[in-house]
């Protein structure tokens, strides 16, 4: 008799793929306009990335550092009108993209929650949640919560409002903290909160250290759903050496939890890609016209257009990973087991019941390595085969689809491999 299938876990929409942050409409659109109407025209691009949610804004009225000039219920006219926003929501819904609205109050100013602990603003966030929930948004983000007095109790209250409206609504909190204890204390009182932090950017970017960070986090959070990013805002390139970008994309998409990216991460956009642009709002490089300052020769492979035409590009890798992440059960909600690893690399298995299993091997080192993967510390349900098929490599030139011997895996410097193998009863 065949073994009984495991019950599928309840999956919310944010469990099924990546979230994509557009914190600056002008930077993202890159055409000087930067408004909600213009954003609508880029929804097809977001669909092509297979992201499940768009974390938008903030777009509310905020006079720098002025509480009285801040209105969480009003859209800054520079970004458009409530009608434009309603139209964006409608179009996004048709493309199955959820909209998460950033309500960080003083986003133009020095301190996101104003210079003193302004309780009146935090109190009014709850009215704003109700207002925008009624308007049809799918969730909210608030950043820099370490600057908010009584953050845990406010988050619990906001979570109640969000969940009270619908279990299908998401609350994301962001913190600059990389301290696990601080992160856990924020998560403790807030079930279902998605927390973005600087936890992973606290790494020395070795395989051993990254493995230790990831496993500590997963052990400490237990069966809570995680999110993975290197910061609460900002680009991967601001935190990572360039040669590790592909490796981190692979890791963020294959760890158990929701990967959260910022616009431009998919093409390796750098904060200062365009001279004279502020670091916080890099201009998205759609095509060569996005940067009049850089020679066309070097620029094509940095743009969305150029990378879309190149199957070996970072963008193509992102799309492939996003596609796998959103359709494979083992990656959607599978169990995670780290394998014993050396200082240069980190490897783990994702598996769910009788579905196809995935093995991720990441070489963080500057030198190639031969890795003999041992299954000594794996439970019986996650045993390793002798060979696994190569689904993709972060480096071009590999013969994808071919079986690789796990006892004698060879990896290039900074190479990551995603391998698959079937369940065997």
């Amino acid at each position: 008799r065949a073994p009984r299938c495991r019950d599928l876990p309840v999956q919310k929409w944010w469990h099924t793929g990546a979230l994509y942050r557009i914190g600056d409409l002008q930077g993202f659109q890159g055409n000087g306009a930067g408004n909600l109407a213009g954003l609508k025209g880029h929804l097809d691009y977001l669909s092509s990335l297979k992201v499940k949610g768009l974390v938008l804004g903030p777009i509310h009225k905020n006079q720098k550092d002025d509480v009285a000039g801040t209105d969480l219920l009003q859209i800054d006219p520079n970004f458009g009108s409530k009608e434009d926003f309603a139209s964006l929501l409608q179009s996004a819904k048709k493309k199955s993209i959820r909209i998460i609205l950033d309500l960080t109050p003083n986003y133009q100013g020095e301190n996101s929650w104003f210079s003193t602990q302004v309780d009146t603003v935090a109190t009014k966030v709850k009215d704003a949640l109700e207002f925008w929930l009624q308007a049809g948004v799918d969730g909210f983000q608030v950043r820099d919560i370490e600057n908010l007095k009584d953050a845990s109790s406010f988050l619990a209250e906001w979570q109640n409002i969000t969940k009270g409206f619908s279990e299908d609504r998401l609350l994301i909190a962001g913190t600059n903290s990389s301290d696990l204890q601080q992160i856990l204390s924020l998560l403790e009182s807030n079930k279902d909160l998605l927390l973005t932090s600087s936890y992973l950017s606290n790494s020395s970017f070795t395989g051993e250290h990254t493995k230790s960070l990831v496993t500590q986090y997963l052990n400490a959070t237990g069966n809570r759903w995680c999110s993975w990013s290197l910061s609460q805002a900002g680009l991967l390139t601001s935190f990572l050496p360039a040669q590790l970008l592909r490796l981190y994309q692979l890791m963020l998409f294959t760890l158990p939890g929701t990967p959260v990216f910022s616009y431009g991460d998919e093409i390796g956009l750098e904060a200062a890609a365009v001279p004279g642009q502020p670091v916080e709002a890099p201009v998205m490089l759609w095509d060569e016209s996005s940067f009049p300052f850089i020679s066309a020769a070097g620029s094509a492979n940095m743009t969305v257009k150029g990378q879309s035409e190149d199957p070996g590009s970072l963008l193509s890798l992102f799309r492939r990973l996003s596609d796998q992440r959103s359709k494979e059960r083992s990656l959607l909600h599978g169990d995670f087991h780290a394998l014993s690893s050396g200082p240069g690399f980190f490897s783990y298995i994702r598996h769910w019941d009788q579905n196809e299993r995935f093995l991720v091997v990441l070489n963080f080192g500057d030198v190639g390595l031969s890795a003999g993967l041992q299954a000594s510390d794996l439970p019986a349900s996650a045993s390793l085969p002798a060979k696994a098929d190569l689904l993709l490599s972060t480096q071009p030139g590999r013969d994808e689809g071919s079986p690789l011997e796990l006892e004698r895996l060879k990896l290039e410097p900074h190479e990551g491999l995603l391998l698959r193998f079937p369940y065997v009863a």
Partner: antibody
């Protein structure tokens, strides 16, 4: 230009409920905060509470057990009910729009609590 | 609750003079303070918000200053129509609270 006008009885008996209505004209009651404030004779101003068009309210803890503020968006009105009144509730009652501070006020209406 | 103290109940001044009305908060309220002018039989009128920003239509002889716990409303070149009571209000924390008021008398 937003204008506010309070209406309601000027005399209420002790232990009864004081009821006032504020009509907003020249603008929509939606997506703003609407407050009640009072000033007893010879004293300072006291904030009673606000309502937001979703029906969300925030009351002064000193009055919370006796206060109800409600909104009728179809009539562009919001109302105050203050129960179990005593002579200490005698005051000029103002309705106002709150943007953290109060930028538009009604003329105010004097309510006397007396038997 | 945050207590806003206006220690001077009355202030006497002459037309053309400069006068300063003060207000002290019982705890740090940043710049989250507004000032109002109230004349008998009329509702209060907003003069200043965020401690120093003049509300639209308010003459520039009214200026606000201060942050933290100490705030000042200054009227330079006092006019006879400035005869009124002046209130401060904090909006840093709920409940919103007002000062007890300072009455300006013209000599």
């Amino acid at each position: 230009q937003v204008q506010l006008q309070e209406s309601g009885p000027g005399l209420v008996k002790p232990s009864e409920t004081l009821s006032l209505t504020c009509t907003v004209s020249g603008g929509s009651i939606s997506s703003s905060y609407w407050s009640w404030i009072r000033q007893p004779p010879g004293k300072g101003l006291e904030w009673i509470g606000y309502i937001y068009n979703s029906g969300s309210t925030n009351y002064n803890p000193s009055l919370k057990s006796r206060v109800t503020i409600s909104v009728d968006t179809s009539k562009n009105q919001f109302s105050l009910k203050l129960s179990s009144v005593t002579a200490a509730d005698t005051a000029v009652y103002y309705c106002a729009r709150e943007t953290y501070y109060f930028d538009y006020w009604g003329q105010g209406t004097l309510v006397t609590v007396s038997s | 609750d945050i207590v806003m103290t206006q220690s001077q109940k009355f202030m006497s001044t002459s037309v053309g003079d400069r006068v300063s009305v003060t207000c002290k908060a019982s705890q740090n309220v940043g710049i989250n303070v507004a000032w109002y002018q109230k004349k008998p039989g009329q509702p209060p009128k907003a003069l200043i918000y965020s401690a120093a920003y003049r509300y639209s239509g308010v003459p520039d002889r009214f200026t606000g200053s201060g942050s933290g716990t100490d705030f000042t409303l200054t009227i330079s070149n006092v006019q006879s129509e400035d005869l009124a009571e002046y209130f401060c209000q904090q909006y840093n924390s709920y409940p919103l609270t007002f000062g007890s008021g300072t009455k300006l008398e013209i000599k």
